[in-house]
Interface confidence: low
Amino acid sequence: MRVLLAALGLLFLGALRAFPQDRPFEDTCHGNPSHYYDKAVRRCCYRCPMGLFPTQQCPQRPTDCRKQCEPDYYLDEADRCTACVTCSRDDLVEKTPCAWNSSRVCECRPGMFCSTSAVNSCARCFFHSVCPAGMIVKFPGTAQKNTVCEPASPGVSPACASPENCKEPSSGTIPQAKPTPVSPATSSASTMPVRGGTRLAQEAASKLTRAPDSPSSVGRPSSDPGLSPTQPCPEGSGDCRKQCEPDYYLDEAGRCTACVSCSRDDLVEKTPCAWNSSRTCECRPGMICATSATNSCARCVPYPICAAETVTKPQDMAEKDTTFEAPPLGTQPDCNPTPENGEAPASTSPTQSLLVDSQASKTLPIPTSAPVALSSTGKPVLDAGPVLFWVILVLVVVVGSSAFLLCHRRACRKRIRQKLHLCYPVQTSQPKLELVDSRPRRSSTQLRSGASVTEPVAEERGLMSQPLMETCHSVGAAYLESLPLQDASPAGGPSSPRDLPEPRVSTEHTNNKIEKIYIMKADTVIVGTVKAELPEGRGLAGPAEPELEEELEADHTPHYPEQETEPPLGSCSDVMLSVEEEGKEDPLPTAASGK
């Protein structure tokens, strides 16, 4: 019953938000030069002073403004806008994107290491050495260190003593030869800004998790990158959003966003930069994309020669070369309850993760049965018009009622027959969100430049993060989709009902094969495959919508799978999704068997 009430409450809240309650306060703005009226949010907004820009669509006070840097610039420790370094050299790849408060960081591309460091980059990259015959890899080469070899121990084949040694050599065949730099002429990292140049990660982490640091995602009072209006937009007019500069396109939120660049040697242009769509790049013939990026590929590799049943085993982002190994056999389910602290895992086993160097894939290179339609921005399309609202309302009432009645009857019958306590409310423990950027933050009032600041109000948060959500899954595996952080764009305003998670209900009872996609900590996509031979009337309790981070300062709000704690008695569902803690051996998220 509680789930029904919660769903109805959410829908009612959505309906309220679809019809804004605030009356326009235009009169309070008139004649007040420090404020302006924003028709989109129907309220008076504080006008940020010159040189400062809003941290949200409709600032209310001076603290809602902060110094704003342009794309490819970051706010340094001295609070100055400083150009981010560029990774445009062929031997460099982007390790971390240019954020509002930290520079882009470049590192040597896979197969190379840095011999001469530079601030946030590398001045000289050399190929990793290859271990000579009779030697094996002790430590594989990383972006910072060369390969370390050691003599092969007796009785072990020197060729394949470790998986690293079975990979194709990443440089010439002369073992331990003096590494050669790729571009000796370029001895220092470029710090000049690139206007629309090589900025693969400006659209960092795709728009699935909408990079808050992406400068294009900032709500701005006047001009956007690529636009140079000579004054703030006239109120209610879209005049300053008509045309973007070359190499910029007008995105769906009406912002001029830099088109990605295909200037890397391993990329070719698939579609050109148009006025309303980004250039798209793809790996050149003979290469496949190992690490996807929005409208591009962050890392192309030659077609790998892998056995049919192999999976990519990523290692340390770009730090180590990718190796291929057979996938692990199915492991025993770990039925341990969550530790007392209830922290969500920072990651699961690497064998199940597809690492994305600062970008989450837009076109996910993995089969998924999860019904997520991706729009051209990579956002799940959840169109919640008024019609859909009523359809959903009716559906929820019908499905919820029948689910409850069916479940109740079945559970009670079983309870009498087996004297078993099968109703487990899912304890949705709020994950402690980890900040991706480890640098100390300036102050609690400084918000991430792109993050949405329309934080849930108390009532809304109360609904969206109910500590106990009784989930009766006799009708199948119902789960809430993890939605992306909403954009903070000038047209954003308070989130509409489309921002609410939409329950999806499957009517299959057996062989539920749910492949869920979790966006973790900005640069990892976890593909959790749950294969469960489930008895009839038993489903999976999936993740509820995670709470938005209080200050929205993390580069990306992680959408973690929820974890269960020791369940209380008296529920209907005896199957739960157990997600491994970081560092646990079991590599797969598994379904716990019936207790």
């Epitope: 010159m50 110094k67 806008c81 150009a83 001009s223």
Partner: antibody, heavy 121, light 108 residues
Framework: EVQLLESGGGLVQPGGSLRLSCAAS????????MSWVRQAPGKGLEWVSY????????YYADSVKGRFTISRDNSKNTLYLQMNSLRAEDTAVYYC??????????????WGQGTLVTVSS | QSVLTQPPSASGTPGQRVTISCSGS????????VYWYQQLPGTAPKLLIY???QRPSGVPDRFSGSKSGTSASLAISGLRSEDEADYYC?????????FGGGTKLTVL
């Protein structure tokens, strides 16, 4: 040492055009917003225009909006002010100034010596 | 007419303390920092006070700034003859930068 040196001033007829330049040195030019501030003879200071470090944001005083255009060339460490449709009241010493100390701050911490623009028939 | 209002002139004798006022509104001084500039005769302006009361390096501690509501003031203690100059207050306005009309300080 931070230095700002204006040039391009002179005598021009009403309705005419003039382009002022400001050569900057001694700091990372592209990291700073820059402004033009003018001072009519015997009068006070009047802010004219502002441009951000990467040229994405530009602001103008109402009195010059639509007639003046601020721009910069970061590769040349130079700030420009293109003045069109000049009027007699635009006669002033034009200073180029570096826009300030940082977060929540809008001071002009360094100024050039100025260049005189005289609009007269 | 300037957005910020300053007295056109002020005077004092050497060693004396002089205060120059600056009055604005909620949209400039009221919601933003105040800056003070000194312009010696025939020279470019020089930043004297930033962030209401902070002195850049090289500015003597005889100069101090304060702000209260929509008004600000510059105080010069131990007045010296070399302090004779024009003093301008300034503040960020909405998408602009506003200066006071300036106060000519005369050291008698």
């Amino acid at each position: 040492e931070v230095q700002l040196l204006e040039s391009g001033g002179g005598l021009v007829q009403p309705g005419g055009s003039l382009r002022l330049s400001c050569a900057a040195s001694g700091f990372t030019f592209s990291s700073y917003g820059m402004s033009w501030v003018r001072q009519a003879p015997g009068k006070g200071l009047e802010w004219v225009s502002y441009i951000s470090g990467g040229s994405y944001y530009t602001y103008y005083a109402d009195s010059v909006k639509g007639r003046f255009t601020i721009s910069r060339d970061n590769s040349k460490n130079t700030l420009y002010l293109q003045m069109n449709s000049l009027r007699a009241e635009d006669t002033a010493v034009y200073y180029c100034a570096r826009y300030g100390y940082g977060y929540y701050d809008g001071s002009f911490d360094y100024w050039g010596q100025g260049t005189l623009v005289t609009v007269s028939s | 007419q300037s957005v910020l209002t300053q007295p056109p002139s002020a005077s004092g004798t050497p060693g004396q303390r002089v205060t120059i006022s600056c009055s604005g509104s909620s949209s400039n001084i009221g919601s933003n920092y105040v800056y003070w500039y000194q312009q010696l005769p025939g020279t470019a302006p020089k930043l004297l006070i930033y962030r209401n009361n902070q002195r850049p390096s090289g500015v003597p501690d005889r100069f101090s700034g304060s702000k209260s509501g929509t008004s600000a003031s510059l105080a010069i203690s131990g007045l010296r003859s070399e302090d004779e100059a024009d003093y301008y207050c300034a503040a960020d306005g909405p998408y602009n930068y506003v200066f006071g009309g300036g106060t000519k300080l005369t050291v008698l």
